[in-house]
């Protein structure tokens, strides 16, 4: 009875996501054999979060709208660790919209999620960010510094990279 | 007021190139994306790509990529739309367009026709 | 690469006649919809944006509607100053590609 009402809560929290993600990959977390983390198939896990790289180009506001639409943000950068795992699936010819921008063009930068702006936790290239024109955050690689952020004009189409909470079923 | 003012027409070979300006004034240069649009004639319009003043980081329409380069000088607030290879289906006038705050075509260039013959 | 489709290419109508226009995406363009006006000769002018956003300056009886796939540019009183080539163009991603236009003729 108890696997039984388990098991019909598992189907009715994976209709919620059928609409965008017809396929989850899911993995057994520990060694209790009720719970289980998802993500969308071909997102990639990482700790408690699933990523998708977005291949196609749009400005930073439809970026994050591409992202929302499938049930999550554009990314947010919490640690080394995460960034170094992220950067593994990037392509090094290529930028790549953060969930971080500066809407008011002072300096008051924001991640999408609201978690709050650490100074001390940043991998902006040198010398960025540099343009009070330029608002939005990419990753990219520049050869002399490998991967790191830059600032751009919002409006110039780039890749993104996508980020959501991992589905515990 | 925006204006963005293009250079005169131009007659090319097939296999030349061709490099269209496009003055822009009456707003801060550096702070608008300029994109580029082309019309063959009594035909639809087509989008080539955009360029980024400040920077210069440029997005291109796959299909012209290897052959449309656009840069700009901000000196002259000018940006420059250069297609090479030319071909008799790229007789077409050419167009810039400014991407407003709303990210649509706020403002447009009058047009320069390219007429690509041998 | 996202296709618009517009219909019809082409049609005839009188000084105050409805007019209507339809643009159709091959994918949800998520209502990042433009349409333009263009005369001969002349640059396409924004009349509409984010599918139903009237543009700076332009008459209120032209109108926009539609959502997903599928969007309408209304004229509800043809005037004279109407007759031109009308474009819908998607800036949901690159690239920014445009409808085949309509015509508007005077009947």
């Known amino acids: 009875n108890f696997m039984y009402s388990k098991t019909v809560k598992r189907l009715s929290k994976l209709r919620e996501y059928q609409q965008y993600h017809p396929s989850l990959t899911c993995v057994m977390e520990g060694k209790d054999i009720e719970d289980w983390s998802c993500c969308p198939t071909p997102w990639t896990s990482f700790q408690s979060s699933c990523y998708f790289i977005s291949t196609g180009m749009q400005s930073w506001t439809k970026s994050q709208k591409n992202c929302s639409v499938m049930g999550a943000d554009l990314v947010v950068i919490n640690t080394r660790e995460e960034q170094d795992f992220i950067i593994q699936n990037l392509k090094r010819n290529s930028s790549y919209f953060l969930g971080l921008s500066d809407p008011g063009g002072r300096r008051h930068w924001q991640w999408v999620d609201q978690t709050p702006y650490n100074e001390n936790v940043t991998f902006w290239h040198s010398g960025e960010p540099n343009n009070l024109d330029e608002r939005c955050a990419i990753i990219n690689f520049r050869s002399s510094e490998e991967w790191g952020w830059n600032d751009i004009h919002c409006h110039v189409p780039q890749k993104s990279i996508c980020k959501m909470k991992k589905i515990y079923i | 007021q925006v204006q963005l003012v293009q250079s005169g027409a131009e007659v090319k070979k097939p296999g030349a190139s061709v490099k269209v300006s496009c003055k822009a004034s009456?707003?801060?240069?550096?702070?608008?994306?300029i994109h580029w649009v082309r019309q063959a004639p009594g035909q639809g319009l087509e989008w080539m790509g955009t360029?980024?003043?400040?920077?210069?980081?440029?997005s291109y329409n796959q299909k012209f990529k290897g052959r449309v380069t656009m840069t700009r000088d901000t000196s002259t607030s000018t940006v420059y739309m250069e297609l090479s290879s030319l071909r008799s289906e790229d007789t077409a006038v050419y167009y810039c367009?400014?991407?407003?705050?709303?990210?649509?075509?706020?403002?447009w260039g009058q047009g320069t026709l390219v007429t690509v013959s041998s | 690469d996202i296709q618009m489709t517009q219909s019809p290419s082409s049609l005839s109508a009188s000084v105050g006649d409805r007019v209507t226009i339809t643009c159709r995406a091959s994918?949800?363009?998520?209502?990042?919809l433009a349409w333009y006006q263009q005369k001969p000769g002349k640059a396409p002018k924004l009349l509409l944006y984010?599918?139903?956003t009237l543009a700076e300056g332009v008459p209120s009886r032209f109108s926009g509607s539609g959502s997903g796939t599928d969007y309408t540019l209304t004229i509800s009183s043809l005037q004279p100053e109407d007759f031109a080539t009308y474009y819908c163009?998607?800036?949901?991603?690159?690239?920014?590609?445009f409808g085949g236009g309509t015509k508007v003729e005077i009947k």
């Open positions: 360029i980024y003043p400040g920077g210069g980081d440029t």
């Open positions: 367009a400014r991407m407003g705050d709303n990210e649509y075509f706020d403002y």
């Open positions: 009456g707003y801060t240069f550096t702070s608008y994306i």
């Open positions: 984010d599918a139903e």
């Open positions: 994918g949800n363009i998520h209502n990042y």
């Open positions: 163009q998607h800036f949901w991603s690159t690239p920014y590609t």
